[in-house]
């Protein structure tokens, strides 16, 4: 950012003219006491952007701060901001006006404070004296601040001339607090209990000795009030607490239950909410969604994890093929269902090195004596596919067949491609695909078997070659979801007397 | 304390062309702040040029390719071009001119601008 005038102090002529300017790389903006003062905005054609504040008719309350800032400092890199300080001598103002809250100085430790008495002009001498005192007090003054020293509890005021005459300030109150803090907690037995049932409450405050509890809740709102119980915590010092204890809760008994504490000697004080629910009756519900087909993949981990929220806590079982099942000492299975929060679970189900025989309709049910749900799916296994024999043959037709047979779950594609270069194929050359309807000199016949007891599929595909005149290197690919497999074969001519 | 006096202006058709100077009693030289503002009847006084340290000038939207300002250091001389003037450019126009170690800033007395068919 750059200011024109630089600044960081001006004194300007009351009545008069004054423009602050300020450039940056983004939109910038002028700000006082917080506002943003009417401003001419601009871009110029080397993309800088400026922002213009043009004070006309100075006086002596135009004396302060002025900030240059970034419109949006969201998007950069430093939150900049250059600081003008501004005098305008105006012997018709004394000191600045304050704002009642800064009349009034409260303190909770010995620490260094500012009495906040400014004057429009920077040649002006300024004294501070305890408002029942005509001695001045030897603390340093800052024309653009005020007094900074360690006061006591005192009334303090400022005074200075102005050409002959004598000017007060407001009076400052210097109050010094002995405080200690409060820090509050709430915690319920339950967050969530069915009509009936009870609901306990505690709220605790630490280092306090004489505190004044009030609770409010939705029974007190109809006027029926229940006493809360305040014991010490023994065993740890200024330990106080308060039980608030409601029997056979009812459904008007949901809603926000709040602790509000006073510490008497200072009248400070904290409070803090909880929020119950009362129910009818418990539930179960599913949150998320789990697909009705899932998938595991041969020899690898799988876990099946379901979301759920209940009350009262459930008991959750796992089925497969509607058989229960539970942690197996071979360690090929392993059940678990933990309690993330008061009413959310997570119920896993872990395959160890998924086998086929794993695949099959699993189902987890979870229930109480209120409510009970239910979620079922259906798991595949995926086995990578493997190329389990590529043979050629030279039937009596005079063709050459190459047969390829593989398996693979879910169902492999079979790619067929050969290369007529042997020394530039495939390292240099791609290799040609086989088995298009337009290519003459192939055909192609596959057929597709389903293995229910290995789950998986068989894929049988015959490549017929009508003619080869030269050595030709088949390649037979099966593909699926899971991976892939490649074998090869050297398909010699007829005539030629050997094959490699 | 420098002074200012505007000239150049007059009534003008609209589509027509002026150049405003604005001339100061002494050296310009310590001026890093220069603007042209207008004020139209009835309405506040609006900045339409500056230019911060001699650097580029910048324009309003409103009069961004129409109008130019520049400088001569050696007349101590303001000048403000003012090309393709429409109705609403109707005002009395004023320079102003400022320096970082000055107390105030300086306007001229202000220059009218009429542009009518």
């Known amino acids: 950012l750059v200011v024109t005038p630089p600044g960081p102090e001006l004194v300007l002529n009351v009545s008069s003219t004054f423009v602050l300017t300020c450039s940056g790389s983004a939109p910038v903006v002028w700000e006082r006491m917080s506002q943003e003062p009417p401003q001419e905005m601009a871009k110029a054609q080397d993309g800088t952007f400026s922002s213009v504040l043009t004070l006309t008719n100075l006086t002596g309350l135009d004396t302060g701060e002025y900030f240059c800032t970034h419109n949006d400092s969201r998007g950069l890199e430093t939150d900049e901001r250059k600081r003008l300080y501004i005098f305008v001598p105006d012997p018709t103002v004394g000191f600045l006006p304050n704002d009642a809250e800064e009349l009034f100085i409260f303190l909770t430790e010995i620490t260094e404070i500012t009495i906040p008495c400014r004057v429009t002009d920077p040649q002006l001498v300024v004294t501070l004296h305890e408002k029942k005192g005509d001695v001045a007090l030897p603390v340093p003054y800052d024309h653009q601040r005020g007094f900074s020293g360690i006061f006591e509890d005192r009334s303090y005021i400022c005074k200075t001339t102005i050409g002959d005459r004598e000017v007060d300030s407001d009076a400052y109150y210097v109050y010094r607090l002995q405080v200690s803090s409060i820090n509050v907690s709430v915690n319920a037995v339950q967050t969530v209990v069915r009509q009936g049932e009870n609901i306990t409450l505690m709220c605790i405050v630490i280092g306090n000795e004489v505190v004044n509890f009030e609770w409010t809740y939705p029974r007190k709102e109809s006027g029926r009030l229940v006493e809360p119980v305040t014991d010490f915590l023994l065993d740890m010092p200024y330990h106080i607490r308060s039980i608030l204890h409601i029997p056979s809760a009812e459904l008007e008994d949901s809603g926000t239950y709040t602790c509000n504490v006073t510490e008497s000697v200072n009248d400070h004080q904290d409070e803090k909410a909880i929020n119950i629910t009362v129910v009818e009756s418990g539930y179960v519900r599913l949150l998320g969604e789990v697909g009705t087909l899932q998938f595991a993949e041969l020899h690898r981990s799988r876990t099946l994890q379901v979301v759920f929220e209940a009350y009262p806590p459930p008991t959750v079982l796992w089925f497969k093929d509607n058989r229960t099942l539970g942690d197996s000492s071979a360690g090929e299975i392993a059940l678990s269902t933990r309690n993330v929060s008061e009413t959310r679970y997570v119920s896993e189900l872990t395959l160890v090195r998924v086998k086929v025989a794993e695949a099959g309709h699993y189902t987890m049910r979870a229930f109480h004596e209120d409510a009970e749900v239910q979620l079922s799916f259906q798991l595949q296994i995926n086995v990578p596919v493997r190329v389990l024999e590529l043979s050629e043959s030279h039937p009596d037709s005079g063709e050459q067949t190459v047969r390829c047979r593989g398996r693979g779950m879910p169902q492999p594609n079979i790619i067929w491609s050969a290369c007529r270069d042997l020394k530039r194929c495939p390292r240099e050359l791609p290799p040609t695909l086989l088995g298009n309807s337009s290519e003459e000199e192939s055909q192609l016949e596959t057929n597709v078997t389903y293995w229910e007891e290995e789950q998986e599929f068989e894929v049988v595909s015959t490549l017929r070659l009508q003619h080869v005149d030269r050595p030709l290197s088949v390649r037979c690919t099966l593909r699926n979801a899971v991976g892939q497999d490649t074998q090869e074969v050297i398909v010699v001519p007829h005539s030629l007397p050997f094959k490699v | 304390e420098v002074q200012l006096v505007e000239s150049g202006g007059g009534l003008v058709q609209p589509g027509g062309s002026l150049r405003l100077s604005c001339a100061a009693s002494?050296?310009?030289?310590?001026?890093?702040?220069m603007a042209w503002y207008r004020q139209a009847p009835g309405k506040q006084r609006e900045l339409v040029a500056f230019?911060?340290?001699?650097?580029?000038?910048n324009y309003v939207d409103s009069v961004r390719g129409r109008f130019t300002a520049s400088r001569d250091n050696a007349e101590n001389t303001l000048y403000l071009q003012m090309n393709s003037l429409k109705p609403e450019d109707t005002a009395v126009y004023y320079c102003?001119?400022?320096?970082?170690?000055?107390?105030?800033?300086?306007w001229g007395q202000g220059t009218q601008v009429t542009v009518s068919s």
């Open positions: 002494e050296s310009i030289f310590s001026i890093n702040y």
């Open positions: 230019s911060i340290d001699g650097s580029s000038t």
């Open positions: 102003y001119a400022q320096g970082n170690t000055w107390a105030a800033g300086v």
